[in-house]
Amino acid sequence: QRLPRMQEDSPLGGGSSGEDDPLGEEDLPSEEDSPREEDPPGEEDLPGEEDLPGEEDLPEVKPKSEEEGSLKLEDLPTVEAPGDPQEPQNNAHRDKEGDDQSHWRYGGDPPWPRVSPACAGRFQSPVDIRPQLAAFCPALRPLELLGFQLPPLPELRLRNNGHSVQLTLPPGLEMALGPGREYRALQLHLHWGAAGRPGSEHTVEGHRFPAEIHVVHLSTAFARVDEALGRPGGLAVLAAFLEEGPEENSAYEQLLSRLEEIAEEGSETQVPGLDISALLPSDFSRYFQYEGSLTTPPCAQGVIWTVFNQTVMLSAKQLHTLSDTLWGPGDSRLQLNFRATQPLNGRVIEASFPAGVDSSPRAAEPVQLNSCLAAGD
């Protein structure tokens, strides 16, 4: 029997972000549930992490007296990421002088758990999503985004931090996963592959997408990122897969057209404010959700991941620009900046829609292999 596609009856479309290609699938095996070491041999296409204090430069951790109320997802201590032994060494991040806490990279020593023990945790991200095993949770309501349509001024900082391109977001972008689950957006960044090689972090039934966007949020229950790290629900990331489509995506073009200016590692530029929600799929009601971690050191757990069912379409030229413009340290291209998928270790991925059933009309009450645990909590 055909495996259901994630997209199924939810055509991509609406705004500049969606098209009606469903999320693809591939009959690739996934060792999602088998415990294993961080990024073991044979793990996915390429391991990696990002730059938050695990998810791309989380806001700077500063004494409260400094820049209060101005969270910058950036410059936290970072560590090296391990490589995938089955993949060519990704030299996007060459070793630098200095202690292990000063940086990390995709591919290579030291193993991430050695420099950030949380990276060896049992509930890490990213993961492989199997729609048929997802627990349908009707209590998962459509996401609510407020203040994401930014005016052109003030401008925003776009930075090549050596392992991703990151856009720092201003105060005022509010997101709710549900009643009482409120967050503030801090930054967004992307993960990508290389020519002919996909680079999303999450996978769907083993299928890796060309790229993935992450919008990182801090719970309103916390004033600072360092307070939220490792706390259940302290951070939340909205993730969407980027796919190739026939037309240029004008929302993404506002960022991609500026990448040449920040080709060099550590460089940054300013870009006009834009509609951040236009970078995401238009359907906020259909998504997968689970508790995981930052995908880069320090790999802090307790992060609520929301992965959209609908994908975002970019042109082939745009995807090429994304994967072929930026440079990391040591004269190496910044490519394949994703971490290998991690085992679920008993976690259940929840779905806001009946993802595990064929969309063709059948039983009114489809049987789900997993039951909803969250109850919208």
């Epitope: 005016p151 052109p152 001024l153 506002q254 300013q270 006009p272």
Partner: antibody, heavy 124, light 107 residues
Framework: EVQLVESGGGLVQPGGSLRLSCAAS????????MHWVRQAPGRGLEWVAF??????????QYSASVKGRFTISRDNAENSLYLQMNSLRAEDTAVYYC???????????????WGKGTTVTVSS | DIQMTQSPSSLSASVGDRVTINCHVS??????LSWYQQKPGEAPKLLIY???NLHTGVPSRFSGSGSGTGFTLTIRSLQPEDYATYYC?????????FGQGTKLEIK
Amino acid sequence: EVQLVESGGGLVQPGGSLRLSCAASGFTFTDYYMHWVRQAPGRGLEWVAFIRNKASGYTPQYSASVKGRFTISRDNAENSLYLQMNSLRAEDTAVYYCVRGGHAGSNYWYFDVWGKGTTVTVSS
Amino acid sequence: DIQMTQSPSSLSASVGDRVTINCHVSQNINVWLSWYQQKPGEAPKLLIYQASNLHTGVPSRFSGSGSGTGFTLTIRSLQPEDYATYYCQQGQSYPFTFGQGTKLEIK
């Protein structure tokens, strides 16, 4: 009174250089993005370059047609804006306007104060 | 770059007429559009900002409307001093671009 006064225009040969100046008065100069906009004879308006305000680090931005040839700068102590034009071409012939646009309270770029303009003619 | 197309390129109208000038934008710019008036030998002057806000000192017969990709400048009752060329400009992202202009002439 808010005022912008340009100077430095003139006749120059192709490949030559020219430096335009703009004296600003009547407002807090450092708060504003400052632009150069040009208008070729009988033609429409073309944005050339801007330099950001203090809050945004005084960094420049250029149109593709002048990038690498023109340099915008400002002297905040003197409330002055400059446009250094090198490798001039016939198509750079235009009236050059110094323009104020965008500040800490703005939410987009509109050009609310214009100078009278200074004429640059590039011809052999 | 964002393309701006004004229509008509020129028009003739009489004093007291209601005049509308259109500006079509190649992509969604929300309301980040301005209108300018330029008389021969003078610098442009800002009339309307953020699609519909009247700039200080501009007569109330001028108004602007629209959002997204379609915008309109309206002069409710044309006055002799209104004969000029009008430009729209997007302030969504650089390079900032202007329409090609609409020349308003006396009928």
